[in-house]
Interface confidence: low
């Protein structure tokens, strides 16, 4: 398994963010596919569950992310994004997400860095 | 407006150290980690590591382990690249750069020249 | 580590042709980003994720391509787009950078 992501994202304060995540696998795509999302906080801090995806969706039932995650992907077409709503600074920080097709070999995980921003996006500066 | 201003030239010999600046400003300097990368004459670009200015985590460039040290200030918003036991293969510019969604805001470079 | 070759090593067009820049990379990436560098600058990026366009940058560039073969396009070159174009990867630990284009005045 092949994971793809970019590199980082900026999302403003308050607004969702999409999670982008694809993946190649040289195995069919069915019932054995698992997807996890994890955080991981900028300041360090402990690694916290975001996400879990195996033939259903299943969302956090406790923590920061609960009830503020939802499944935005289609395994059928190779994605395994999320949709993170409601942003918070305490947001920043990388998300890893980690696809597992047996009986293809487990990939590297991919990351994300999520920069939640004030409402000015540094995509709207130019450049210097 | 972001700006990431660097320390200016420097000349070594072989064996010494060097420590190069990067002070940032413009935008919260702890969103977002501070990549240095290092461009040798005439050569291309080659990422030496990164570092989260948040905790001081630090993630390497395999080829650039143990005489390379990154580090940050957080309270002057400036970021550091100290290089130790210099050779001459070291002479480059060495950029700091901060990677956002769509652009990157690099410093204007810093030439390290290490000559006996 | 990735590896990213970039051909040809120095194209020699005339202002107002179209140039086509390629980066092939040695095993599959996500995604391209590419950069711009004129001598005694900082490189300048142009195209992140493949095919956006950093701000400001002109619609004569766009970028294309997946797997391991990625491709910057200048559709009519202007006199202030000869410089070296870089690629780079960020699919893998670390990020790497091809060697450069030179694109130089024919």
């Known amino acids: 398994v092949e994971i793809y992501t970019s590199r980082v994202l900026e999302a403003v304060n308050g607004t969702d963010a999409r999670l982008k995540c694809t993946f190649s696998s040289f195995a069919p795509v069915g019932d054995a596919l698992t997807v996890t999302w994890n955080f991981r906080p900028l300041d360090g801090g402990p690694e916290q569950f975001v996400f879990y995806y195996h033939i259903d969706p299943f969302q956090p039932m406790s923590g920061r992310f609960k009830d503020r995650v939802s499944w935005d992907g289609n395994p059928e077409r190779y994605d395994a994004s999320i949709l993170l709503w409601k942003l918070q600074f305490d947001d920043n920080g990388t998300y890893t997400c980690q696809v597992k097709n047996p009986p293809d070999v487990d990939g590297v995980i991919g990351e994300i860095r999520l920069s939640v921003v004030h409402t000015v996006r540094f995509s709207e500066i130019h450049f210097l | 407006q972001v700006q990431l201003v660097q320390s200016g030239s420097e000349l070594k010999k072989p064996g010494a150290s060097v420590k190069v600046s990067c002070k940032a400003s413009g935008y919260t300097f702890t969103n977002y980690w501070m990549h240095w990368v290092r461009q040798a004459p005439g050569q291309g670009l080659e990422w030496i590591g990164e570092?989260?200015?948040?905790?001081?985590?630090?993630d390497y460039n395999e080829g650039f382990t143990g005489r390379f040290v990154l580090s940050v200030d957080k309270s002057s918003s400036t970021a550091y690249l100290q290089i130790s036991s210099l050779k001459a293969e070291d002479t480059a510019v060495y950029y700091c750069t901060i990677y956002t969604t769509a652009l990157d805001y690099w410093g204007q470079g810093t030439l390290v020249t290490v000559s006996s | 580590e990735i590896v990213l070759t970039q051909s040809p090593a120095t194209l020699s067009l005339s202002p107002g042709e179209r140039a086509t820049l390629s980066c092939r990379a040695s095993?599959?990436?996500?995604?391209m980003y590419w950069y711009q560098q004129k001598p005694g600058q900082a490189p300048r990026p142009l195209i992140y994720v493949t095919s956006n366009r950093a701000t400001g940058i002109p619609a004569r560039f766009s970028g294309s391509g997946s797997g391991t073969d990625y491709t910057l396009t200048i559709s009519s070159l202007e006199p202030e787009d000869f410089a070296v174009y870089y690629c780079?990867?960020?699919?893998?630990?670390?990020?790497?950078f091809g060697q450069g284009t030179k694109l130089e005045i024919k």
């Open positions: 095993s599959s990436v996500g995604y």
């Open positions: 570092i989260n200015p948040t905790n001081g985590g630090t």
């Open positions: 780079q990867q960020w699919s893998s630990n670390p990020p790497t």
